[in-house]
């Protein structure tokens, strides 16, 4: 229904706390360099204005669209051109072009320092002094570094943060209470960020149809007892919610997400037997819980699908009459039978089925042509299954750090032109798949591994788009989203690459490395490993292992030495010489 004042409608629906949080996230995602105080001031102004509209929907400007109101606020910021360069040109445009322009200027890799967590005492002090400001800082810092973070989900993580601080700041040993809990939230939030970015990429590059197909597959796996009409309704609503969030319409997105959660909880009988626990929770927790609810028990006696999709004489007629509905039904029926497949794999199978029907239904004898289509799926299914087996075996043998290093070597060989920091970040993220997925039961491994890898590779593609340097990467990133992971997996050593010259300074280390946290030490070592591969792309695994073991031994020795600086300056050059010899 149409409301006289959109802003009053959203304020009433969401309540002041969530309204303010979402407006803060929106501004932080659009203008990523502004300080918290600048954004907090704008948020307060917008909230005060919303309250006047709640009091009188006919008041001046209350009938304006949210994009107009928010855009006008952003464009009124002083020194916009000095701080944001060409983004200021967006302000010369009218809506909806102005909002599109803002969206295009979102930076997936802003040059902001890493979000450093203060030490426990300091954190607890500022949290106790002003919990609202403290949480505002959290929303601002995360949103500006992750401009596509799913806004209602970020409110959920802020709520988790709040609960952890409330609990741990009352403890004697705040540090040991806070660290593991906050690390857990951080890890989950980072995964949530790359997953949501993938959804927005799908929406931006391939449109709503592509996202809806993703949603149909995912929902059919989770709710195998729901009928096709129910799955279609949920997928349509979920597509709308994600389109709004990806498009910067965060108030509408959060409001519609709450509506969808309400609908699901009111219709459990036709959706799933597993929803009740989620539905007993308050709003943010409820929506989060529903988004990752366990799969419902599969029906006991689902028949094979060949009868409807291969053996039926009317296949081409049914397909021609309503292509998307017929393909949607195929995807639904296949997905509800295979919670053990990744969504990416299911979409590849549906794409293969569609291509087969397009080809065969134009021929003289279609049934003879498409009769073997399901058998032709086998290699498509075997490929990711083999990938999971091979990589989980390797992870179990090497552990997370060693597995990351193996991936780093592999990917540096595939795309040596990519910057070392990007390769290290990608390999570290890709390597976490082992810890995340390889310990799961067998039927959950494939969906976990492949859908996570796809999301990480989407980030690789986004970073590469900014500064394209590798034809290999461009080729894999240009195709469809679901083909990316198999494309990257199939890449081999880039034969066109001219090896980097050996620079001693790249492998020169100083005693400051000894005091770094373990994670930072690993990154330093992995940076050196990537540089080694760039110098010798065809070095064998044994050669690289020799060099890295020598390097680890050197660090261990010098960091234990009484005079660390002398050790580094005398042993360092010897290490460099040995490395050169080992790789000769």
């Amino acid at each position: 229904e149409a409301h006289k004042s959109e802003i009053a409608h959203r304020y009433n629906d969401l309540g002041e706390q969530h309204f303010k949080g979402l407006v803060l996230i929106a501004f932080s995602q659009y203008l990523q360099k502004c300080s918290y105080d600048e954004h907090a001031k704008l948020v307060q102004e917008v909230t005060d204005f919303a309250k006047t509209c709640v009091a009188d929907e006919s008041a001046a400007n209350c009938d304006k669209s949210l994009h107009t109101l928010f855009g006008d606020k952003l464009c009124a910021i002083p020194n916009l051109r000095e701080n944001y360069g060409e983004l200021a040109d967006c302000c010369t445009k009218q809506e909806p072009e102005r909002n599109e322009c803002f969206l295009q200027h979102k930076d997936d890799n802003p040059s902001l320092p890493p979000f450093e967590r203060p030490e426990a005492e300091a954190m607890c002090t500022s949290f106790k002094e002003n919990p609202t400001t403290f949480m505002g800082h959290y929303l601002h810092e995360v949103a500006r570094r992750h401009p596509y973070f799913y806004a209602p989900e970020l409110l959920y993580y802020a709520e988790q943060y709040n609960e952890i601080l409330t609990q741990c700041c009352a403890e004697a040993d705040k540090e040991s209470c806070l660290t593991p809990k906050l690390d857990g939230v951080k890890e989950k939030a980072l995964v949530s960020s790359v997953r949501q970015r993938m959804k927005c990429s799908s929406m931006q590059k391939f449109g709503e149809r592509a996202f809806k197909a993703w949603a149909v597959a995912r929902l059919s796996q989770t709710f195998p007892n729901a009928d096709f009409a129910e799955i279609t309704k949920l997928a349509t609503d979920l597509t709308k919610v994600n389109k709004e969030c990806c498009h910067g319409d965060l108030l509408e997105c959060a409001d519609d997400r709450a509506e969808l959660a309400k609908y699901m909880c009111e219709n459990q009988a036709t959706i799933s037997s597993k929803l009740q626990t989620c539905c007993d929770k308050p709003l943010l927790k409820k929506a989060h819980c529903l988004s990752e609810v366990e799969h419902d028990t599969m029906p006991a006696d689902l028949p094979a699908i060949a009868a409807d999709f291969v053996e039926d004489q009317e296949v081409c007629k049914n397909y021609a009459e309503a292509k998307d509905v017929f393909l949607g039904t195929f995807l639904y029926e296949y997905s509800r039978r295979h919670p053990d497949y990744s969504v990416s794999l299911l979409l590849r199978l549906a794409k293969k089925y569609e291509a087969t029907l397009e080809k065969c239904c134009a021929e003289a004898n279609p049934p003879a042509c498409y009769g073997t289509v399901l058998a032709e799926f086998q290699p498509l299914v075997e490929e990711p299954k083999n990938l999971v087996k091979t990589n989980c075996d390797l992870y179990e043998k090497l552990g997370e750090y060693g597995f990351q290093n193996a991936i780093l070597v592999r990917y540096t060989q595939k795309a040596p032109q990519v910057s070392t920091p990007t390769l290290v970040e990608a390999a570290r993220n890709l390597g976490r798949v082992g810890t995340k997925c390889c310990t799961l039961p067998e039927d959950q491994r494939l969906p976990c591994v492949e859908d996570y890898l796809s999301a990480i590779l989407n980030r690789v593609c986004l970073l590469h788009e900014k500064t394209p340097v590798s034809e290999h990467v461009t080729k894999c990133c240009s195709g469809s989203l679901v083909e990316r992971r198999p494309c990257f997996s199939a890449l081999t050593v880039d034969e066109t690459y001219v090896p980097k010259e050996f620079k001693a300074e790249t492998f020169t280390f100083h005693s400051d490395i000894c005091t770094l946290p373990e994670k930072e030490k690993q990154i330093k070592k992995q940076t050196a490993l990537a540089e080694l591969v760039k110098h010798k792309p065809k070095a064998t695994a044994e050669q690289l292992k020799t060099v890295m073991d020598d390097f680890a031994q050197f660090l261990d020795t010098c960091c234990k030495a009484a005079d660390k600086d002398t050790c580094f300056s005398t042993e360092g050059p010897n290490l460099v010489t040995r490395c050169k010899d080992a790789l000769a």
Epitope: A300, D301, P303, A304, Q378, V381
Partner: nanobody, 115 residues
């Protein structure tokens, strides 16, 4: 060509136990359902127990608590452990394995419960 072979049937006294096994040979991939059905003389074939790809199990009310279905994915095998057998369990037991392309059945193995 996919072939299913059941084994483990036989004559057993009431209260006794049997373990049925079924192995699939040939090229079967993408299995999402494995089940045991039975058919007593003059009756319709009925589902006894099934296990889906996610490990969910389903049992006919008449066998709940007495029969247990399990599978070995790697070997494409499905088992039915039958305890506390009753004369009413007498039937030919059929193994059924499904992928999206088809429904594959074994020849059946006879189970007779009699004193």
């Amino acid at each position: 060509q996919v072939q299913l072979q059941e084994s483990g049937g036989g004559l057993v006294q009431p209260g006794g136990s049997l373990r049925l096994s079924c192995v699939a040979s040939g090229s079967i991939w993408g299995i999402y359902h494995m089940g045991w059905y039975r058919q007593a003389p003059g009756k319709q074939r009925e589902l006894v127990a099934s296990i889906t790809v996610d490990g969910s199990t389903h049992y006919a009310d008449t066998v709940k608590g007495r029969f247990t279905i399990s599978k070995d994915n790697a070997a494409n095998m499905v088992y039915l452990q039958m305890n506390a057998l009753e004369p009413e369990d007498t039937a030919v037991y059929y193994c059924d394995i499904r992928n999206v392309g088809g429904d594959y059945w074994g020849q059946g193995t006879q189970v007779t419960v009699s004193s």
